[in-house]
C-alpha cells in the first residue's frame, strides 16, 4: 500500500487540535529556561527537579548535592543563596510580595561545614532584603527600614542605620517610585568588590504626598493602604548615598558621598551605583528634568576616611532631542585599569552604541556603529567585550550576542549566536561565569526556547542545559497559528509589525483583526520570541488575526523614532496604530467591520485613545488598567517623557492627552474598561475618572473591576479576566460561543 503525501497530511490534520483557552490559563504550553547560578569561573549551582541544590563543575564534569531537599523542605524554602566562602547558605521562606520587585521573607542560615542550621543571634523576621558580601560570609540585611551587618552568620548584628521608619525613611531599600521607575530592584545597597565597604541609599519620603486606597480583605472594615507616591509635578523623595567600612563599622560610621554641584543645584535623582574597586566607586545622578545625567567617580581618602569625587572625574551625558538614555540611563562597565569604562549612549547619528570613555565623554571612542542599536554589555574581560544588539539582518526585534576582541588592534567583531540555530533562535540573552570562562546562552525564540552552555574562549557549545523536549512533544498535535514579522514604510517611518494568523489562513478570506498594543516609550512588542498565549488561542481557535505594531516612541531603532513622542505622549503612538490598521485593511484579508484593539497599562491608554480617535476603524476595544491622565502617574516615569505639569512647562499637553477629554468619542464603539482596585502602580483612580467622564457624557460602556488586585491581575483574576475578554471579543466579532 502506497500512502500519498496528501493522505498523510490529512490524517495528521485530523489528529491535530486548536489551542483552547483552558490550555492558556493552565499554562499547558509554558517553557523552561536554564540560568546557571555561577559561583566561580567553572562552577554553577542549580536546583534539580527534586529540589536538591546541586553544584556542577564544568571542567571535571562532576556534580554533587550541596544542600539536600530535606533541608529545603524543613523550612519550606523557596529560594537560597550560597555565601562566597561556601560555608553557609541562606534559605528564604514565607515569601510575601510587596511591589514589583520587593518582598519580605524569613531567612534561615544553614552551615554547610557543620551540617546544621545556625542557632543563636538569629535573623529577625520578616526581612526586607538580605545579601552576602562578595567575599567570605558577611551578611547585610534590611529590617524595618534599617540596615544591619553581621561579620559571620552566628554573630550578633551591628546596626548601621537608626532613622528607618515605615513610609518615611528607607535605608538600603528603595521607596515605591525608586523601586518601580529608577532602580528596578528591591535593594538599594551595594557591597564593594571584596566586601570592605558597603554603600547604601537613604530615601526620605517625609514630604511626599500619599496615595491611599481601600483593601477590602475579609474584615468588617476595609484596610487603607498608604503609599508615598509622587505623581507628576509632586514633591519627590530626597536621596542620600552613604558608605560604611564593614571591617570597623563603629570607627567612623557611614560617610556621605557628595552630590555633583551641577546636580545638587535643583531637584535630582540618584540613578545607580557601580563599584570599581574596593576604594573607588561610581555614582550616577540625574536632574529631575531628565535630559542631563552625571556619572561621578569617587575615591576613598584614607587620611580623612571620606569619599572624594573630583570634578575631573565627572562625566556629563546630555540629550538635546529627548531624555537621557533609553528607558534608564545606561550603567558603565569598567575595564581592568579601574578608571576607563564602556557605556551605551547615542552616537552622532542618533543610535545607541557602545563607547569607550578613557578621560572625557567628548573624547569617547565609539566601539560599535550602524543603523541598529547595541542593547546590553554583558561582560568585559582583558581581551573581549560581550554585548547584545539587533544588528543581524536588520531586524530590530532580534537579539544576538557578539564578541569584540578588545585585546587586539584593530578590534575584531564576531557574532556568537547568529548562525547557531538560525531558524529556531533569533532572540538571545546570556549569563557569564567569572572571567567569562564559560557562558550560558538562553534562546527565547522564535522557535521553542533552548538553553545551552558554551566555552568562553572558543564559543563551542558544551551541552544543552534545557531544550523543552516535553513542550515540543506536547505541541506536536496542536494547530499553532502562523507568525510573521514584517515592516510597513509610511511617511519615512518604519513600522515593524508582528502578525499572528490562524492555522488555515487563506488570503482570499476575510478575518476579524485584533490589535494588541503596548506602545510605551522605549518598549518593544515586535520581538522574535516564542509564546503560546491568549492571542495564540484567539488565532488558533477563534480564527482571528492579531497584530502588534511598534510605532513612534518604541525602542532600538534609533533616537528619531524613540524621541518622537518626547513631551507629547498619546499622539503619535495612537496615530501609528491607526496607520498600521489602514495598511492591514489594504492587504485584503481583514474584515473592516470587525476590528478591535486592546492593551494593558500604557497599552490600555493607547487602546482607549485609539478607540476615541473618531476614525470609525474600531468596532470595539478593551483597556486593562489604563493610565487616563499623565497627572495621575508617577513623577519619575511621566516627567522623563512629558516634562512638568506646570503652565510654564507642559501643562497644556498633560490636559490635552487625557482619555477623559475624549469621552464623547466613545459613543460609537464598544468599550470594556478593566482595573484592579488595589493597583499600586496605575491607580484605580485612572479608570474611575474614565468611568465618571463616560457617565457624565452619557456614553454606554462595559466595565469590570477586580477587588484587591494589583496591576498584574494575578491568580484566579487572570482566568476570570481572559475569559471575560474572550466573551467580549467574540460578541463584538459575532463569533459563536
Amino acid at each position: 500500500i502506497v500512502l500519498r503525501p496528501s493522505r498523510v497530511h490529512n490524517s495528521e490534520e485530523n489528529t491535530m487540535r486548536a489551542l483552547t483557552l483552558k490550555d492558556i490559563l493552565n499554562g499547558t504550553f509554558s517553557y523552561k529556561t536554564f540560568f546557571p547560578n555561577w559561583i566561580s569561573g567553572q562552577e554553577y549551582l542549580h536546583q534539580s527537579a527534586d529540589n536538591n541544590i546541586v553544584l556542577y563543575n564544568i571542567e571535571t564534569g562532576q556534580s554533587y548535592t550541596i544542600l539536600s531537599n530535606r533541608t529545603m523542605k524543613s523550612v519550606n524554602a523557596s529560594n537560597y543563596g550560597l555565601s562566597p566562602d561556601r560555608q553557609f547558605v541562606y534559605l528564604e521562606s514565607d515569601y510575601s510580595k510587596l511591589w514589583r520587585y520587593s518582598y519580605t521573607a524569613t531567612y534561615y542560615i544553614y552551615d554547610l561545614s557543620n551540617g546544621e542550621f545556625v542557632r543563636g543571634n538569629e535573623l529577625p523576621r520578616p526581612i526586607q532584603y538580605l545579601c552576602w558580601s562578595p567575599v567570605g560570609s558577611k551578611l547585610a540585611y534590611v529590617y524595618q527600614n534599617n540596615i544591619y551587618l553581621k561579620q559571620r552568620p552566628g554573630d550578633p548584628p551591628f546596626q548601621i542605620t537608626f532613622n528607618g521608619r515605615e513610609n518615611k525613611i528607607f535605608n538600603g531599600i528603595p521607596d515605591w517610585v525608586y523601586e518601580e521607575e529608577m532602580l528596578a530592584t528591591k535593594y538599594a545597597l551595594w557591597w564593594s568588590p571584596n566586601g570592605k565597604f558597603l554603600a547604601y541609599a537613604e530615601f526620605n519620603d517625609t514630604d511626599i504626598p500619599v496615595i491611599a486606597y481601600s483593601y477590602y480583605g475579609d474584615e468588617q472594615y476595609p484596610r487603607t493602604i498608604n503609599i508615598p507616591y509622587p505623581k507628576a509635578g509632586a514633591k519627590n523623595p530626597v536621596v542620600r548615598i552613604f558608605i560604611i567600612d564593614t571591617t570597623y563599622p563603629a570607627y567612623v560610621g557611614p560617610q556621605e558621598v557628595p552630590v555633583p554641584a551641577m546636580i545638587a543645584s535643583s531637584d535630582y535623582y540618584f540613578s545607580w551605583l557601580t563599584w570599581v574597586t574596593d576604594e573607588r566607586v561610581c555614582l550616577q545622578w540625574l536632574k529631575r528634568v531628565q535630559n542631563v545625567s552625571v556619572l561621578s567617580i569617587c575615591d576613598f581618602r584614607e587620611d580623612w576616611q571620606t569619599w572624594d569625587c573630583p570634578k575631573t572625574q565627572e562625566h556629563i551625558e546630555e540629550s538635546r532631542t529627548g531624555w537621557a538614555g533609553g528607558f534608564f540611563v545606561s550603567t558603565p562597565v569598567f575595564s581592568y585599569d579601574a578608571i576607563s569604562y564602556y557605556k551605551i549612549f547615542s552616537d552622532k547619528d542618533g543610535y545607541k552604541h557602545i563607547h569607550y570613555i578613557k578621560d572625557t565623554v567628548e573624547n569617547a571612542i565609539q566601539i560599535t556603529s550602524g543603523k541598529w542599536e547595541a542593547i546590553n554589555i554583558f561582560r568585559v574581560t582583558q581581551d573581549s567585550l560581550f554585548y547584545s544588539s539587533n544588528e543581524f539582518e536588520e531586524y530590530p526585534g532580534r537579539r544576538n550576542i557578539y564578541r569584540i576582541s578588545i585585546g587586539s588592534y584593530p578590534p575584531s567583531k564576531k557574532c556568537v549566536t547568529c548562525h547557531l540555530r538560525k531558524e529556531r533562535c533569533q532572540y538571545y540573552t546570556a549569563s557569564f561565569s567569572d572571567y567569562a570562562k564559560y557562558y550560558a546562552l538562553v534562546c527565547y525564540g522564535p522557535g521553542i526556547p533552548i538553553s545551552t552552555l558554551h566555552d568562553g574562549r572558543t564559543d563551542q557549545e558544551i551541552k544543552i542545559l534545557e531544550e523543552n523536549k516535553e513542550l515540543e512533544n506536547a505541541l506536536k498535535n496542536i494547530q499553532l497559528p502562523k507568525e510573521e514579522i514584517k515592516k510597513l514604510e509610511v511617511d519615512e517611518i518604519t513600522l515593524w509589525y508582528k502578525m499572528i494568523l490562524p492555522p488555515q489562513f487563506d488570503r482570499s478570506k476575510k478575518y476579524p483583526l485584533l490589535i494588541q498594543v503596548y506602545g510605551g516609550p522605549c518598549s518593544q512588542s515586535v520581538r522574535s520570541v516564542f509564546a503560546v498565549n491568549w492571542i495564540s488561542y484567539l488565532a488558533s481557535k477563534e480564527g482571528m488575526v492579531i497584530a502588534l505594531v511598534d510605532g513612534r516612541g518604541t525602542a532600538f531603532q534609533g533616537d528619531k523614532l524613540l524621541y518622537a513622542v518626547y513631551r507629547k505622549l498619546g499622539v503619535y503612538e495612537v496615530e501609528d496604530q491607526i496607520t498600521a490598521v489602514r495598511k492591514f485593511i489594504e492587504m485584503g484579508f481583514i474584515d473592516e467591520k470587525r476590528i478591535a484593539i486592546w492593551g494593558w497599562s500604557y497599552g490600555g491608554y493607547v487602546s482607549s485613545l485609539a478607540l476615541a480617535s473618531g476614525t470609525g476603524l474600531f468596532k470595539c476595544g478593551i483597556a486593562v488598567a489604563p493610565v487616563s491622565s499623565w497627572e495621575y502617574y508617577a513623577s519619575v516615569y511621566t516627567e522623563r517623557f512629558m516634562g512638568l505639569p506646570t503652565k510654564d512647562d507642559n501643562l497644556e499637553h498633560y490636559k490635552n492627552s487625557t482619555v477623559m477629554a475624549r469621552a464623547e468619542y466613545f459613543r460609537n464603539v464598544d468599550y470594556l474598561l478593566i482595573h484592579g482596585t488595589a493597583d499600586d502602580n496605575v491607580h484605580f483612580q485612572n479608570s474611575a475618572q474614565i468611568a465618571k467622564a463616560l457617565v457624565n457624557a452619557q456614553v454606554d460602556f462595559q466595565a469590570m473591576w477586580y477587588s484587591d488586585q494589583n496591576h498584574g491581575l494575578s491568580g484566579l483574576s487572570t482566568n476570570h479576566l481572559y475569559t471575560h475578554m474572550t466573551h467580549f471579543l467574540k460578541q463584538c466579532f459575532s463569533l459563536s460561543d
Partner: antibody
Framework: QVQLVQSGAEVKKPGASVKVSCKTS????????IHWVRQSPGQRLEWMGG????????NYNQKFKGRVTITRDKSSSTAYMELSSLRSEDTAVYYC?????????????????WGQGTLVTVSS | DIVMTQTPLSLPVTVGEPASISCKSS????????????LAWYLQKPGQSPQLLIY???TRESGVPDRFSGSGSGTDFTLKISRVEAEDVGIYYC?????????FGGGTKVEIK
C-alpha cells in the same frame, strides 16, 4: 559496628607540623560531620574544628585558624587534621568524633562516637 | 563564645549513693523554635575516649543505664546518677552544641570514696 580509628602517637619538634588521620567504618561516611577535639594535660576538652564529608567544607575554631587544616578523603572514608607551627602547649591527645548531619531545622546532634585518641607530643 | 562552668571540680561518692553535677552556660541553650536545649553530657573513663551519655539536656543515649538522668533548661543543667556504681568513675563533661565554637565544661571528676 561504628568505628573511628585514629593514627598512632607522634613526637614532633616545635615549629613542625603533624597530620592525624581518622578512618571511619560501620556507617555512611557522608551522613555525619567529623570533628576534632583535643585534650591537653590538665585542660578541658577543646573543639578545634570539623568538616562536612559531603562537600569537604571545614569549619575552624578561630583560636586555631591559620594553623589547623581539616580535610577528608571520601573514597576511603577518612578525615585528617593537620596542625602546623607546633609549640609545646600543643602537646595533647587529639580525638576525632562524629556528629550526625542535621537536615531539618529542628535537629541538632551531639558527638555520639569518638576515636581512640592520638597522643601528639611536642618537644625539642 | 559560650562559656560552660561545671561544679564541683571533684566529687567523691559512695557506691549506691546518688550523685549530682551542675553545669551552667553563659547564655541560654534553649532554642525557642523547638524548645530543645542543646546540651550534652559525656563520661570519660580512665584511659578511654569520651562517651555520650545524654543529649538535648535530658535524652539518654541508647545503651546508657537509666540511673543517669539529665535535667535543666536555658542556662542551668544537672546530671544525676541515682545510685553510683563502681564503673561510673571518670570525668564527666557537659558540652553545648547550640552554637559554634562548640565548648565543653571543665569537667567533674567522680571517684569512689
Amino acid at each position: 559496628q561504628v568505628q573511628l580509628v585514629q593514627s598512632g602517637a607522634e613526637v614532633k619538634k616545635p615549629g613542625a607540623s603533624v597530620k592525624v588521620s581518622c578512618k571511619t567504618s560501620g556507617y555512611t561516611f557522608t551522613e555525619y560531620t567529623i570533628h576534632w577535639v583535643r585534650q591537653s594535660p590538665g585542660q578541658r576538652l577543646e573543639w578545634m574544628g570539623g568538616i562536612n564529608p559531603n562537600n569537604g567544607i571545614p569549619n575552624y575554631n578561630q583560636k586555631f585558624k591559620g594553623r589547623v587544616t581539616i580535610t577528608r578523603d571520601k573514597s576511603s572514608s577518612t578525615a585528617y587534621m593537620e596542625l602546623s607551627s607546633l609549640r609545646s602547649e600543643d602537646t595533647a591527645v587529639y580525638y576525632c568524633a562524629r556528629r550526625r548531619i542535621a537536615y531539618g531545622y529542628d535537629e541538632g546532634h551531639a558527638m555520639d562516637y569518638w576515636g581512640q585518641g592520638t597522643l601528639v607530643t611536642v618537644s625539642s | 563564645d559560650i562559656v560552660m562552668t561545671q561544679t564541683p571540680l571533684s566529687l567523691p561518692v559512695t557506691v549506691g549513693e546518688p550523685a549530682s553535677i551542675s553545669c551552667k552556660s553563659s547564655q541560654s541553650l534553649l532554642y525557642s523554635r523547638n524548645q530543645k536545649n542543646y546540651l550534652a553530657w559525656y563520661l570519660q573513663k580512665p584511659g578511654q575516649s569520651p562517651q555520650l551519655l545524654i543529649y538535648w539536656a535530658s535524652t539518654r543515649e541508647s545503651g546508657v543505664p537509666d540511673r543517669f538522668s539529665g535535667s535543666g533548661s536555658g542556662t542551668d543543667f544537672t546530671l544525676k546518677i541515682s545510685r553510683v556504681e563502681a564503673e561510673d568513675v571518670g570525668i564527666y563533661y557537659c558540652q553545648q552544641y547550640f552554637s559554634y565554637p562548640l565548648t565543653f565544661g571543665g569537667g567533674t571528676k567522680v571517684e569512689i570514696k
